[in-house]
Amino acid sequence: SIPWNLERIIPAWHQTEEDRSPDGSSQVEVYLLDTSIQGAHREIEGRVTITDFNSVPEEDGTRFHRQASKCDSHGTHLAGVVSGRDAGVAKGTSLHSLRVLNCQGKGTVSGTLIGLEFIRKSQLIQPSGPLVVLLPLAGGYSRILNAACRHLARTGVVLVAAAGNFRDDACLYSPASAPEVITVGATNAQDQPVTLGTLGTNFGRCVDLFAPGKDIIGASSDCSTCFMSQSGTSQAAAHVAGIVARMLSREPTLTLAELRQRLIHFSTKDVINMAWFPEDQQVLTPNLVATLPPSTHETGGQLLCRTVWSAHSGPTRTATATARCAPEEELLSCSSFSRSGRRRGDWIEAIGGQQVCKALNAFGGEGVYAVARCCLVPRANCSIHNTPAARAGLETHVHCHQKDHVLTGCSFHWEVEDLSVRRQPALRSRRQPGQCVGHQAASVYASCCHAPGLECKIKEHGISGPSEQVTVACEAGWTLTGCNVLPGASLTLGAYSVDNLCVARVHDTARADRTSGEATVAAAICCRSRPSAKASWVQ
Amino acid sequence: QDEDGDYEELMLALPSQEDGLADEAAHVATATFRRCSKEAWRLPGTYIVVLMEETQRLQIEQTAHRLQTRAARRGYVIKVLHIFYDLFPGFLVKMSSDLLGLALKLPHVEYIEEDSFVFAQ
């Protein structure tokens, strides 16, 4: 029997496999910013370089007794989870430890920043293979810590951070809230969110995925041959850092965007009981548990997409929400969601050379979310076509008029605030293939892309009877790029993508008074990439 | 993920009457002061002064030195603990919170963040 956590994240076909870079040596280096560690432990000796970096605050309390094994406990365990010979995820990986947490597990933002700068300097002085930085720590939201993570990520370093153990929104903590880090929540052996005393794993839109983080067996600093179990989002992050190290060991040229997309795509889906999370966070929290993905050679040129939620706009009348993709990703569609249903739609606009997804609150609304669908589309050329709102009673049509461009998403934005005078926008798949159709007072935005072998089609599913949500999924081999809710209910909450599922949400009151003839339709745009084929629209 | 979280951002654009010094009075602070929303996690007295992205190496040092000089005129001792060159331009400083208004008016300053604790998870 192998430890449950390794069984969970490493599929059977990987168990005996040794991950090696093409030239035969594992050149990936993991930097661990944590407590001091016991480098002589049987799990990690010979694999760990204990750097001379030390930037920690004084321990609290006059009677604090600095006991080496206690000081090393957290870091040693994590080093073992990442690269331990017998209980580690990436057994061959070399690891560098930087001490930024004291014997009580406390550090400072400034100490962490100096540690990150130390890594950057090391990188400049002696460029090496791929670097993974593990940040098994969390503090309150810090603009500068997030900015430092962004700067380091842009140099090609992959940062993995603990979501935090506060049973709270991870966006309120750093570095968990930095978009450029891979943020990891913790699950237990039953794939359920980890409870830690009265608290537990953080959650929300800033979490990228979950990984084992309860009763994780790893190196104990008590003795050089001891093992112990520890729990927390640090352990979960260490698993993902190990997975990333293995991915990079096989394919050293994988970028952060590719790594994140592949982690998400190949994770175990829908096993977490979302009821553990606060109701307002359930839709924002990914239902994903990490597993080691196969190499790109085994999976071919699959179109990979992820959903990125914005922060909540807030309730003011003109409040907007903005969702952004990573620089390497293409924004293929933009939708919006509001719990009250009072929203004025969504659109894509360019800000500083990058296309962003925006959503607008409506008068009396409690606020909106913008929902971006961010995809990896090799050699893509994407553009937005928009048409201002038509006169009353007329439809607005937008299609992709450039040769070989296909429709990947539609957005609709209403000029009027009076929700009663407008009908919902529509997507027409049969009568007008590849068109976005908006009803009165709606500006329509079509996201059009050209990429080698990219083909797309619309898939719709409608429900006439009472239903809180309507869903439609893209079939195997196709990837969801766009998701919209079509006319039917007098009030829809909006639409969003969950993995390959398009979810259209309907307001409770709208359900009650709807006539049977008014179907609410979830419309998905499903695309696939077939590098040998020409870009096309599939009817 | 890119919006500021539960975070305290305080505008400390105080009137610029700094000992009647012309160069100081001319510069009105547009920089902001930020600190952790959780009071128990704050480390008052230690601040990360973050400069504009294009700030040159020499300018970072000059800004830190200028802050020390101006603080000294007011009878305060400032300790520059670290200068950041490689990830972002800025410096870490130990000083009285009384000097925040002064620091925010320095040229090149984008924002100042009070240091705070992070914890093993």
Epitope: P3, I217, S220, S224, T225, C226, F227 | -
Partner: antibody
Framework: QLQLQESGPGLVKPSETLSLTCTVS??????????WGWIRQPPGKGLEWIGS???????YYNPSLKSRVTISVDTSKNQFSLKLSSVTAADTAVYYC??????????????????WGQGTLVTVSS | EIVLTQSPATLSLSPGERATLSCRAS??????LAWYQQKPGQAPRLLIY???NRATGIPARFSGSGSGTDFTLTISSLEPEDFAVYYC????????FGGGTKVEIK
Amino acid sequence: QLQLQESGPGLVKPSETLSLTCTVSGGSISSSSYYWGWIRQPPGKGLEWIGSIYYSGSTYYNPSLKSRVTISVDTSKNQFSLKLSSVTAADTAVYYCAREGSGVVPAAGPNWFDPWGQGTLVTVSS
Amino acid sequence: EIVLTQSPATLSLSPGERATLSCRASQSVSSYLAWYQQKPGQAPRLLIYDASNRATGIPARFSGSGSGTDFTLTISSLEPEDFAVYYCQQRRNWFTFGGGTKVEIK
């Protein structure tokens, strides 16, 4: 119950390689709960740990012997082996194999040598 | 490496007497210390682990105590089969054994 049995030549020439095998019966060497170790005892002297191995093949050696020791495992035969190269008369000893508990699963537990094989005397002489 | 020093080298006692064996470590081994018994021509047998825990099947007359650097093995009333060599062993930093204490019949 679990039993361990050492086997191999009782006489080795100086500068050659000493080779011993330990056969485990009454239990599986593939258990993730244990490591498997070699310990030696020169005549009339104390005990010295040589090294240990995990079923996965991970090896751990006494730093003073590291350059000369190789321990390997054959899970199909439920055996693990010791090779000690460039032997001298100082390597003359009774060589014991033993189970070192506990390994990775469970994480906590007695991490000691128990049980032991009955030992085999290896004499290094020309 | 951690050096374990056992004393006395030889202890001459009669059956029924109390035996007290000492083991001192060159640095702290916490409670990661074991005691083994070895009879002539036999392999060592685990008596005590983690300083004070009796191994399976070991009679109650054997007890261990101590932590850090000083440890004691006590045999409350010597039986004839208890006359043997006793070794201490640490696992704080890999594995090292003490030089042994021979308990012989007086």
